[in-house]
């Protein structure tokens, strides 16, 4: 098995992630590991030499770059907000603000915008991952009410007067609760699913 | 049999420019590194510029880097050096090499040269 | 960039003599070091490459040894067209470097 640098006449190298083709030399020579970046290039008798990248500053692949990428915080401005720190081996991770939507993605997020509300008698679809897109509002499913323009707002069960002892007064629709009603005594339509003592 | 002829060679005024071309037959140009090597009057050799086999790569010493472009045409069987700003230490013959493309790297056939002189 | 100190740098001899010619790298090349002949008003011509080896059609009296840093080129016994100057160039690393020259001389 060689060992970097060899010859390669064919302009490719046995292992592509940890070696690259050097065309000047016309060898094979290794990358850097995760971290670090070329200090001195390569050469037919000498192989590459790495050095560990400065604080602040990243690689985050077997590489062969004569620099470190430089952190970078998460914008605020652009809704962003770090979930793990930059490290020399990776770059800051960053998510939407809670309420927020990726709208510019560009290998990662770039900006985030606020979520649409969904109106009375709907709700956001639930995404697999939080942040990736605007809502989607779909209707509160049978037996379930949302009341509110919100991005948040979860349909909730209607009221099971039964529960509470008490008889329906009204239905409950998508926008609005059951209204219940003492058995015995007749309740104003504004004390929906509560009970008058 | 492989041949490299130069032409193109002349006198130029310091600040000129000039084009050297190497015709090359008897081999398949398009699969070989080629270079150009000068050699000032009553000096040593020295290496002035490289170009992959495919032309994509290009190579020179800090000497004339920035004022000299090599370039071929491999449909042509050419290989060219452009030279500008051209200065008194540029007086040199210019020979055109190829290196051999196994993996020992020397160049194995040599033109017979051109004579730049730049002199006001 | 690499330096090679050839000596010396001229030469008398005779014809029948063994002639040696040196070639130091600054650092070790790793044997990429070939000799080559010039003639005047000619181009250089391989003798030797990857420090040891005989290019194609190049008479056996020529031969390379070396290593590391020291290479040497030896002729065994001149002829009368072997009177040239002759130069190594190393080809590890770039800037590819020629040593100063060596030119031989009939005494």
């Known amino acids: 098995q060689a060992v970097p640098p060899y010859a390669s006449e064919n302009q490719t190298c046995r292992d592509q992630e940890k070696e690259y083709y050097e065309p000047q030399h016309r060898i094979c020579c290794s990358r850097c590991p995760p971290g670090t970046y070329v200090s001195a290039k390569c050469s037919r008798i000498r192989d590459t030499v790495c050095a560990t990248c400065a604080e602040n500053s990243y690689n985050e692949h077997w590489n062969y770059l004569t620099i470190c990428q430089l952190c970078r915080p998460c914008d605020p401005v652009m809704g962003l907000e770090e979930i793990a720190p930059c490290t020399s081996k990776r770059k800051t991770q960053c998510r939407c603000q809670p309420g927020m939507f990726c709208a510019a993605w560009a290998l990662e997020c770039t900006h985030c915008e606020l979520l649409s509300d969904c109106p009375p008698g709907t709700e956001a679809e639930l995404k697999d991952e939080v942040g990736k897109g605007n809502n989607h509002c779909v209707p509160c499913k049978a037996g379930h009410f949302q009341n509110t323009s919100s991005p948040s707002a979860r349909c909730q069960p209607h009221t099971r007067c039964e529960n509470q002892g008490l008889v329906e007064a009204a239905p409950g629709t998508a926008q609005s609760d059951t209204t219940c009603k003492n058995p015995l005594e007749p309740l104003p339509p504004e004390m929906s699913g509560t009970m008058l003592m | 049999e492989v041949q490299l002829v130069e032409s193109g060679g002349g006198l130029v005024k310091p600040g000129g420019s000039l084009r050297l071309s190497c015709a090359a037959s008897g081999f398949t140009f398009s699969d070989y590194y080629m270079y150009w090597v000068r050699q000032a009057p009553g000096k040593g050799l020295e290496w002035v510029a490289t170009i992959s086999d495919g032309g994509s790569y290009t190579y020179y010493p800090d000497s004339v880097k920035g004022r000299f472009t090599i370039s071929r045409d491999n449909a042509k069987n050419s290989l060219y050096l452009q030279m500008s700003s051209l200065r008194a230490e540029d007086t040199a013959v210019y020979y055109c090499?190829?290196?051999?493309?196994?993996?020992?790297?020397?160049?194995?056939?040599w033109g017979q040269g051109t004579t730049v002189t730049v002199s006001s | 960039d690499i330096q090679m100190t050839q000596s010396p740098s001229s030469l008398s001899a005779s014809v029948g003599d063994r002639v040696t010619i040196t070639c130091k790298a600054g650092q070790d090349i790793k044997s990429y070091l070939s000799w080559y002949q010039q003639k005047p008003w000619k181009a250089p011509k391989i003798l030797i490459y990857?420090?040891?080896r005989l290019a194609d059609g190049v008479p056996s009296r020529f031969s390379g040894s070396g290593s590391g840093t020291d290479y040497t080129l030896t002729i065994s016994s001149l002829q009368p067209e072997d009177f040239a100057t002759y130069y190594c160039?190393?080809?590890?690393?770039?800037?590819?470097?020629f040593g100063g020259g060596t030119k031989l001389e009939i005494k």
């Open positions: 990857y420090a040891t």
């Open positions: 090499a190829r290196e051999e493309n196994g993996n020992f790297y020397y160049f194995d056939y």
């Open positions: 160039l190393q080809h590890g690393e770039s800037p590819w470097t």
